[in-house]
């Protein structure tokens, strides 16, 4: 059986949309599947790598690598999207390419970044972890760390930094898929909203879905003990 909830929820484009949340109901009238997984049910993607989920994550990363920051021209906010999802008339798509990106580092002025920009994250304005010396952030946004401390400045002069961010990574469903969404949409979809991150590649959704003890390597499921828990 399925339980369907419909609600007007604030979406990425800043408008309220009617959204459906379909929940698979437990045949035996009990906890939901997500709760059962959290409680230690035998759910194979938490025990060993699942090819389907792995393919999904890789596909999400490939898309994210090509994303940019979509800044609304009316200053209502910004969100990380694909170029096709950013209005050409109502917004500005901030994407580094063809020599327009910043240098990789102040010591290497000739090598430009081509991956980015990222809404609310920039190697030039992040103090911790700083992109410098032996720890220069790679030219692949899907390998960027979470910035835990921004430079103390209320304005940076960068379009993708001075905007109000409207979406962050949200882990949705038992498949551990991730979407950049508004907090409202994420909560309505019973997802896990990552306030601290800017990109889906910075979060490990399956780790969150599985619960219990975190994976030793967030990319590799290792909860073999589930075989005895249930």
């Amino acid at each position: 059986a399925q339980h369907v909830t419909t609600q007007l929820v604030l979406r990425n484009k800043g408008v309220y949309e009617s959204v459906k949340y379909i929940q698979q109901e437990n045949f035996w009238i009990g906890p939901s599947s997500i709760d059962l997984i959290h409680l230690g049910a035998k759910f194979s993607p938490c025990i060993r790598k699942d090819q389907q989920i792995e393919q999904l994550v890789l596909r999400e990363r490939d898309l994210e690598r090509d994303s940019g920051c979509c800044v609304q021209n009316d200053h209502s906010g910004c969100i990380q999207t694909q170029r096709k999802d950013c209005s050409e008339t109502l917004a500005t798509f901030v994407k580094w390419q063809d020599d327009t990106g910043p240098p990789m580092d102040k010591s290497d002025l000739g090598q430009k970044r081509t991956s980015g920009a990222v809404c609310h994250q920039d190697p030039r304005t992040c103090e911790e972890p700083a992109s410098s010396g032996a720890h220069i952030w790679p030219d692949d946004i899907t390998k960027w760390p979470i910035c835990t401390e921004q430079a103390k400045s209320n304005r940076t002069g960068f379009l993708h930094m001075d905007c109000q961010i409207k979406g962050r990574p949200c882990c949705i469903s038992t498949k551990g898929s991730c979407e950049i969404t508004t907090r409202e949409y994420c909560e309505f979809m019973h997802g896990y909203f990552h306030e601290e991150a800017t990109l889906c590649s910075q979060v490990h959704c399956l780790d969150k879905v599985c619960g219990l003890l975190p994976f030793l390597n967030p990319e590799v499921p290792d909860q073999f003990y589930r075989l005895w828990l249930s």
Epitope: T100, K106, S107, L109, G110, S132, A151, T156, G157
Partner: antibody
Framework: QVTLRESGPALVKPTQTLTLTCTFS??????????VGWIRQPPGKALEWLAH???????YYNSALKSRLTISKDTSKNQVVLTITNMDPVDTATYYC???????????????WGQGTLVTVSS | AIQLTQSPSSLSASVGDRVTITCRAS?????MYWYQQKPGKAPKVLIY???NLASGVPSRFSGSGSGTDYTLTISSLQPEDFATYYC?????????FGQGTKLEIK
Amino acid sequence: QVTLRESGPALVKPTQTLTLTCTFSGFSLSTFGMGVGWIRQPPGKALEWLAHIWWDDEKYYNSALKSRLTISKDTSKNQVVLTITNMDPVDTATYYCARISNYGSNYWYFNVWGQGTLVTVSS
Amino acid sequence: AIQLTQSPSSLSASVGDRVTITCRASSSVSYMYWYQQKPGKAPKVLIYDTSNLASGVPSRFSGSGSGTDYTLTISSLQPEDFATYYCQQWNAYPLTFGQGTKLEIK
């Protein structure tokens, strides 16, 4: 308000060492992303970049003069010091210090300059 | 080192004229920076990242270009614009400036 002021001797003898001090206010060189550079201008000639120093103490020098230049900072005093050894009459110039910032810029630029100090090298 | 060659080295123009100064780099650069210097004064930034106007700079100033060729344009000369203009690159060390363009009153 950001201001920078250069100070040092107006006259130095050939072979001597020149020490120039840039005292600034309105910003801190411990602030992430900040830098201070030195640029000189011989009378009636073009600008020439000498060196700059960043908030994280990384230093960059003009390779043509590198062996003669040393730049350092004293964050607590809001000062940057440039020393040039073995001065020669061709080093006669107005020496400027300037703040480096990347506000809104993909690279960086000298966005505020001091008024400059004229240094003459003569025996 | 990347050499920047400005042209012309000097030019005479009248108030209200449209003026264009060119800066050619010996090898490709990503962005150009332009400074204005008045006699006895320190330089002041006009344009950063090729085309962005620095804070407080009048909109009659504009910059454009890519690769090795960049231009600074003053759409309608004002009396206070008579000065020397320098281009500068931040693409490779050592940082270099052009030799300057002196703009004089005709």
